[in-house]
């Protein structure tokens, strides 16, 4: 807490500039009036505050708005945002993408922290879900992001997002996340045709279930390995050594190389020896 | 406060069903799932089935022909019902919360004794 | 269905000591794409239902105290009560969430 202390004759601020950084932690506390502040936030950034000074700021703002900052003043905290709590956060109400955008700007290229965390979570809230736009922009910044929501998070997101999603933003996703992810893939990308919609779905395969991989089987898809080692175990149980060699196309001799894991290996176990021996790839059940 | 209560009959005669209601607060049930757990006296616990905030259901294969898990998300209640109970289904019934995953709250259960 | 198996199934400890409990799975509960392990811990005192101690086989539950420590990956874990207290009497139970939702037996926990 900054003591209390009059203003010096003629240091009173008329105006956010550079002649406030040679200002004591004091001086900002008493010369810089908060409404000023507030309507001239956009100036901050371009003045080379020490993070001391940032802290006097930031206290100034929290007395003129303890139940927290309007927009108009978020958008323009630039650096003043990494002194920011997550509890500062929540006090938000943030509805423009543009703001998000500014603020993610400030933490390009470090890990998601908990204030981003926090952020991104009160903005997808107040949208009630995740649209285009917005997933647009957050995997653009954290190509991870999609992959670290619950699937229940990832159930408020519409299929027309989908579009959105990268084969990347994918990698790290599980298969419960997946389970969700799927459906709204196989809905979103109903009206392409077999090869675009292959190469569209194949990302989300991991939650696809059975019938729908027989039904790939049919489209002379040429699934790759690593694909079919991401697909459900359960799903790939049932399918015939003819559905599979149809679904993996030229890939097929991958399995070979794969047959200790799941769940090639599992598969391999529930086909009859005859069968297998169809591939001519030395598979032993 | 999230808090999940539970309330069911006690006592169920042997081939009859079994209806539980789970009724929540503090929480949506379109953000997050709700499971039920059984717990057979003195010993471990057993899950049976979930519903998802979107309303999808996933049951235990071994019990899935006995059960249904259905919610009515403006009431705030879940709802399990399992059919033709016998005395190995006398057990505490758990409804818990998940976001997909682990399960962070737990209801105090329900004792269900199944007799005649 | 992936099954959990957990040693001893019992053990008694004095107040102060240093427990550790084993939950082993029959496949492995880490997802190689996010290298997380899909693996839990409940505590649950007579009378009472579980309450979530550990997630992710190692991150403590807000409001658990730090004497609890979840550890291990893959197949093979470890919950760990750093110096046990009277009132952490309770059968410890482990749960893994990476397909579909199966528990260990619980290992019960008693003070001499």
């Known amino acids: 807490e900054v003591e209390k202390t009059a203003c010096p004759s003629g240091k009173k601020a008329r105006e956010i500039d550079e002649s406030l950084i040679f200002y004591k932690k004091w001086e900002l506390e008493a010369c810089v009036d908060a409404a000023l502040l507030a309507t001239q936030m956009d100036r901050v950034n371009a003045i080379p505050f020490t993070y001391e000074q940032l802290d006097v700021l930031k206290h100034k703002l929290d007395e003129l708005y303890p139940q927290g900052y309007p927009e108009s003043v978020i958008q323009h905290l630039g650096y003043l945002f990494l002194k920011m709590s997550p509890e500062d956060i929540r006090k938000w109400n943030v509805t423009s993408l543009e703001t998000l955008k500014a603020l993610l700007e400030v933490n390009k290229g470090h890990e998601m922290s908990p204030q981003v965390a926090t952020l991104i979570d009160r903005f997808v809230k107040g949208r009630g879900q995740l649209d285009k736009d917005t997933l647009d922009t957050l995997t653009a910044f954290y190509p991870g992001y999609l992959c670290s929501l619950s699937p229940e998070e990832l159930s408020s997101v519409p299929p027309s997002s989908i579009w959105a999603v990268r084969p990347q933003d994918l990698d790290t996703c599980d298969p419960r996340q997946l389970d969700v992810l799927y459906p709204k893939a196989r809905l979103a990308f109903q009206n392409m045709n077999g090869s675009e919609y292959f190469v569209k779905i194949q990302s989300f395969l991991g939650g696809a279930p059975t019938e729908d991989l027989k039904a790939l089987s049919q489209q002379n898809v040429s699934m790759d390995l690593a694909t079919f080692m991401k697909l459900r175990t359960d799903a790939v149980l049932p399918l015939t050594v003819a559905e599979v060699q149809k679904l993996l196309g030229p890939h097929v001799e991958g399995l070979k190389a794969e047959e200790r894991h799941r769940p090639v290996r599992d598969w391999i176990l529930r086909q009859r020896q005859d069968d297998l021996d169809t591939l001519g790839l030395g598979l032993q059940g | 406060e999230v808090q999940l209560q539970q309330s069911g009959p006690g006592l169920v005669a042997p081939s009859q069903s079994l209806s539980i209601t789970c009724t929540v607060s503090g929480f949506s049930l379109s953000r997050y799932s709700v499971h039920w757990v059984r717990q057979p006296p003195g010993k471990g616990l057993e899950w049976l089935g979930m519903?998802?905030?979107?309303?999808?259901?996933d049951y235990n294969s071994a019990l899935k022909s006995r059960l249904s898990i259905s919610k009515d998300n403006s009431k705030s209640q879940v709802f399990l019902k399992m059919n033709s109970l016998q005395t190995d289904d006398t057990a505490m019934y758990y409804c818990?919360?998940?976001?997909?995953?682990?399960?962070?709250?737990w209801g105090a259960g329900t004792t269900v004794t199944v007799s005649s | 269905d992936i099954v959990m198996t957990q040693s001893p199934s019992s053990l008694a400890v004095s107040a102060g000591e240093k427990v550790t409990m084993s939950c082993k799975s029959s496949q492995s509960v880490l997802y190689s794409s996010n290298q997380k392990n899909y693996l839990a811990w409940y505590q649950q005192k007579p009378g009472q239902s579980p309450k979530l101690l550990i997630y992710?086989?190692?991150t403590r539950e807000s409001g658990v105290p730090d004497r609890f420590t979840g550890s291990g990956s893959g197949t093979d874990f470890t919950l760990t009560i750093s110096s046990v207290q009277a009132e952490d009497l309770a059968v410890y139970y482990c749960?893994?969430?990476?397909?579909?939702?199966?528990f260990g037996g619980g290992t019960k926990l008693e003070i001499k």
């Open positions: 992710w086989a190692s």
């Open positions: 519903i998802w905030g979107g309303g999808n259901t």
């Open positions: 818990a919360r998940s976001l997909g995953w682990y399960f962070d709250i």
């Open positions: 749960h893994q969430y990476l397909s579909s939702w199966t």
